[in-house]
Every structure is written in C-alpha cells, then in structure tokens.
C-alpha cells in the first residue's frame, strides 16, 4: 500500500463561452468501488470547494443538479468540465480524489490546473 498520485494539466484556457475541460487521472493503490472527486479552487491561501461527486467504479459521475461541473469517468480517469466561468474565476483548480470504499481510505490531490478565463468582448452596436 502506498500514497495515491493524481495528475492534471498545468494550464487550460476556457472557451469564449466560459467552459473549461480537463482530465484528472489517478493511480489507484487500492481496489476501490466508490470514489469521490472534488474540484477545489485555490486563491491566495484560501481553498474553496467548487463541486464534488461520488461515483461507483464503472458507473457515471453524477454532480448535483445545480453544480457548475459535469464529468465522465473511465477507469482511473475523470474528464471534468466547469461551466459558467468568467474572467474573475481565473485561478488554480485542484483535483482531489478520495477512494472511499472499501477501507482503507486513500487521498490524492493534484498540483492544480491554472484555468484562464477571458470575458468575450461585447458585440459592437450596429448603426442601421
């Protein structure tokens, strides 16, 4: 048994519609059947939870209905999408993976993905 490693891209640029996607991959040291994935945002020294989902291995990832996150899972890889981002949301987004069941519990925290969000320029008014 050993600690769990989590890998995620260093940088991602959100689309003009404020959508950012990245892959979070973990090297599972145990045979987990229940996994929890959490996206954290780190700004200065403050860490806040953006969204979280628990899934059974082999099943789909389900975030709450009002979550700004969606995702799919495939083996030890989770494809995460964060929506509704604005320029002020630019920051470091950390992927946290927890192997919840069966015991022992394992924690894995990625180094974070810096997501850059650029608000689209407003369309110029037409003069006719």
């Amino acid at each position: 048994c050993k600690a769990m490693h989590v890998a995620q891209p260093a940088v991602v640029l959100a689309s003009s519609r404020g959508i950012a996607s990245f892959v979070c991959e973990y090297a599972s040291p145990g045979k987990a059947t229940e996994v929890r994935v959490t996206v954290l945002r780190q700004a200065d020294s403050q860490v806040t939870e953006v969204c979280a989902a628990t899934y059974m291995m082999g099943n789909e990832l389900t975030f709450l209905d009002d979550s700004i996150c969606t995702g799919t899972s495939s083996g030890n890889q989770v494809n995460l999408t964060i929506q509704g981002l604005r320029a002020m949301d630019t920051g470091l987004y950390i992927c946290k993976v927890e192997l919840m069941y069966p015991p022992p519990y394992y924690l894995g925290i990625g180094n974070g993905t810096q997501i850059y969000v650029i608000d689209p320029e407003p369309c110029p008014d037409s003069d006719f």
């Epitope: 600690a3 040291p29 927890e98 919840m100 022992p104 519990y105 924690l107």
Partner: antibody, heavy 118, light 107 residues
C-alpha cells in the same frame, strides 16, 4: 468562525459504555469528514475513527474496531462516538477534528476527558 | 499501517536559536504530511500541511521540507511561545498516523 465543542466525557467503570458528542458550527458540517483523535495522559496523539460525507463511510483504528462506533447527525451538526466495553487503556482526552478540504486536520475541539477506572 | 518516527525526542534550545525536527515514515507518504503544535492543556494546532504549506495564521519562521519518507520542520528563530510538543502526521491513507512527538523545551 469554525467551532468544535466536545462533551460527554467523565469517569466510567471498566466494561461500561459512554457516548461522546461534538457540536460543530461555523461551516457546512455535511461537506466535511470528521475525526476522533485521543491522547492518553502524558502520551502522544492517536487517531481513533473517521466518518466521511455519507454516514455509511467510516473507518476505525484497530484499537477501536468492534467496540467504538462513530456516527453523525448532519441535521444537528453533531458528531458522536459511542464507546462500549471500555478499558483502562481507553483513558484519554478525546478530540474531534475536521478533515479540511486539503486533507489535514484543520480545526480541533478543546477535548473531553474520559477516565476508565474502578 | 504507516509508522512515523520523530527525532529527537526532546530538543533543548534557547530563544532565538534554530530548531530542526525530523520525521521519518516507514513508507512513502508523498506530500500528505502535516505538522501540529501542542501546548500543555491545549488542543493540537496545525502548522504545516502538504509538507511545506503553512496553515492559516502561522508565522513564516515555521517551514517544512522533505519528500517521500524523510521530512523536516524548521523553526528559524525560536520565540518563547514556540516551546511545545510537535507532532508529524500522515493523512494520505487510513489508518491516519501520528509520530510520537518532539518536545522543544527551554535550555
């Protein structure tokens, strides 16, 4: 601000039971894992048990398995530790602690003393 | 379970001196290592998490370093309020384990 307040400690005879409580405030209780950690007089820290986000997700130290039960009531923002078949070696200050978003134990209660003695 | 060993057991130093505390794990804990400070009659207080990140409100005279199985807590210049017991802890897997502690006392 985050606050954790333990209660329920006291003097109990060997073989008897005791239930500890930890009242939490200042944060969204249901979003955090919660731990019990104990410290025997003059000794170091010993992790006892954890309960995660769902009430079914629990884990115990070997010394607690089969005798102690951790539980939580998210509607009351309260963590519990039911301790059965108590032994003299369970004498300790029992702390509840929050599992922070980054995993380490970021907030601790002031502790409650449990003395098992005949 | 991961066993943590701390050395020395006791460190006798004077205010203003540098304190170096060691923590060794029986197997790799990667970066899931924290340090806590405890004073008599008080609950532990987190100092360092993730090997080297300072917890909220912790002065920069406290620093952590290391990787894998060998870790160090350094207090650059001891202040009177720093004399206490220090515990390392791994939180990457259960059972969560603490080291036996290092007592830093006044010489």
């Amino acid at each position: 601000q985050v606050q954790l307040v333990e209660s329920g400690g006291g003097v109990v005879e060997p073989g008897r039971s005791l239930r500890l409580s930890c009242a939490a405030s200042g944060f969204t209780f249901s979003s955090y894992g919660m731990h019990w950690v104990r410290q025997a007089p003059g000794k170091g820290l010993e992790w006892v048990a954890v309960i995660w986000y769902k009430t079914s997700e629990k884990d115990y130290a070997d010394s607690a398995k089969g005798r102690f039960t951790i539980s939580r009531d998210n509607s009351k923002n309260t963590l519990y530790l039911q301790m059965n078949s108590l032994r003299a070696e369970d004498t300790a200050v029992y702390y509840c602690a929050r599992a922070g978003l980054l995993g380490y134990f970021d907030y601790w209660g002031q502790g409650t003393l449990v003395t098992v003695s005949s | 379970e991961i066993v943590l060993t701390q050395s020395p057991g006791t460190l006798s130093l004077s205010p203003g001196e540098r304190a170096t505390l060691s923590c060794r794990a029986s197997q790799s804990v990667t970066s899931y290592l924290a340090w806590y400070q405890q004073k008599p009659g008080q609950a532990p207080r987190p100092l360092i998490y993730g090997v080297s990140s300072r917890a909220t409100g912790i002065p920069d005279r406290f620093s952590g370093s290391g990787s894998g199985t060998d870790f160090t807590l350094t207090i650059s210049r001891l202040e009177p309020e720093d004399f206490a017991v220090y515990y390392c802890q791994q939180y990457g897997m259960s059972p969560f384990t603490f080291g036996p502690g290092t007592k830093v006392d006044i010489k």
